[in-house]
Amino acid sequence: EEELQMIQPEKLLLVTVGKTATLHCTVTSLLPVGPVLWFRGVGPGRELIYNQKEGHFPRVTTVSDLTKRNNMDFSIRISSITPADVGTYYCVKFRKGSPENVEFKSGPGTEMALGAKPS
């Protein structure tokens, strides 16, 4: 059984204010069963960026259809980028548990930074 890896290929992503940013995340295994969430930052204070199951994320869309049973692409798009969006973003796999899901593995993170405006 292959051990799950969380792949975030870009270490740094330069984005432009007002544009849409795509944060890539793929997994190498469908197991263990459980959701993938997106966070900004690390530690107790990390901010929830996207949770497929619940929440309000008006600027976030998924690249793939997460409801498909064999989906392994958990990439997201964040629209209307502002300077307040900079930071390091992590996709994190949770293992389904009762009563609560348990964090299983985190991706290495993608730092989103503002790039120069196109001339």
């Epitope: 969430l37 930052g41 530690g43 107790p44 204070g45 990390r46 901010e47 929830l48 309000h56 609560e100």
Partner: antibody
Framework: DVQLVESGGGLVRPGESLRLSCAAS????????VTWVRQAPGEGLEWVSL???????YYADSVKGRFTISRDNSKSTLYLQMNSLRAEDTAVYYC???????????WGLGTLVTVSS | EIVLTQSPGTLSVSPGERATFSCRAS??????LAWYQQKPGQAPRLLIY???TRATGIPARFSGSGSGTEFTLTISSLQSEDFAVYYC??????????FGGGTKVEIK
């Protein structure tokens, strides 16, 4: 505008219990960790407890086993259940929103808890 | 647990003057240090994080510097509304989140 409003403070005797509430508005409550910080009369700030977006809880050693932090995302409300209260728990209790940088960017006005016989 | 020590305990300054005070950490916190301002009867207000980044809406007269274990908050020209207590907080090693004991800036 971000608003945090604490309630539930008051005068209790040592050994008694109290539950504080903090009603949040002006931001997406479910997306942020929230925390309690207290300040004894004439003293500095002391971090008490934090609950993450996924519900993981953290406590200062001084309150571990006596205080319980919880959140109701459907009501955008943070709670602090305080049991076995001691005189040294007397303080103004503030709730605060936590940023992804692990700093506290918005604070309520606080609620005073007095523990005295 | 990281212990933060602020000095001086009280600083007497005249309006318009420069005020500088420090925060020392018991072990390195990199650049992960924040500063808060608290006026009597009010809640604390975030001023600076990451040692030198001003929080939203904070005037340019407030500046932070330092890294590792030694940090400084400077108010370039004190206004009447700046007389308050200032606390530092480390945001690299949690829990617990720790604060310094505070520096009171009073009118000279």
């Amino acid at each position: 505008d971000v608003q945090l409003v604490e309630s539930g403070g008051g005068l209790v005797r040592p050994g008694e219990s109290l539950r504080l509430s903090c009603a949040a508005s002006g931001f997406t409550f479910t997306n942020y960790a929230v925390t309690w910080v207290r300040q004894a009369p004439g003293e500095g700030l002391e971090w008490v407890s934090l609950i993450s977006v996924t519900g993981t809880t953290y406590y200062a050693d001084s309150v571990k086993g006596r205080f319980t932090i919880s959140r109701d995302n459907s009501k955008s409300t943070l709670y602090l259940q305080m049991n076995s209260l001691r005189a040294e728990d007397t303080a103004v209790y503030y709730c605060a929103k936590v940023t992804w940088k692990n700093v506290f960017d918005y604070w309520g006005l606080g609620t005073l808890v007095t523990v005295s016989s | 647990e990281i212990v933060l020590t602020q000095s001086p305990g009280t600083l007497s300054v005249s309006p318009g003057e420069r005020a500088t005070f420090s925060c020392r950490a018991s072990q390195t916190v990199g650049s992960k240090l924040a500063w808060y301002q608290q006026k009597p009867g009010q809640a604390p207000r975030l001023l600076i994080y990451d040692a030198n980044t001003r929080a939203t809406g904070i005037p340019a007269r407030f500046s932070g510097s330092g890294s590792g274990t030694e940090f400084t908050l400077t108010i370039s020209s004190l206004q009447s509304e700046d007389f308050a207590v200032y606390y530092c907080q480390q945001h690299t090693d949690w829990p617990p989140y720790t604060f310094g004991g505070g520096t009171k800036v009073e009118i000279k």
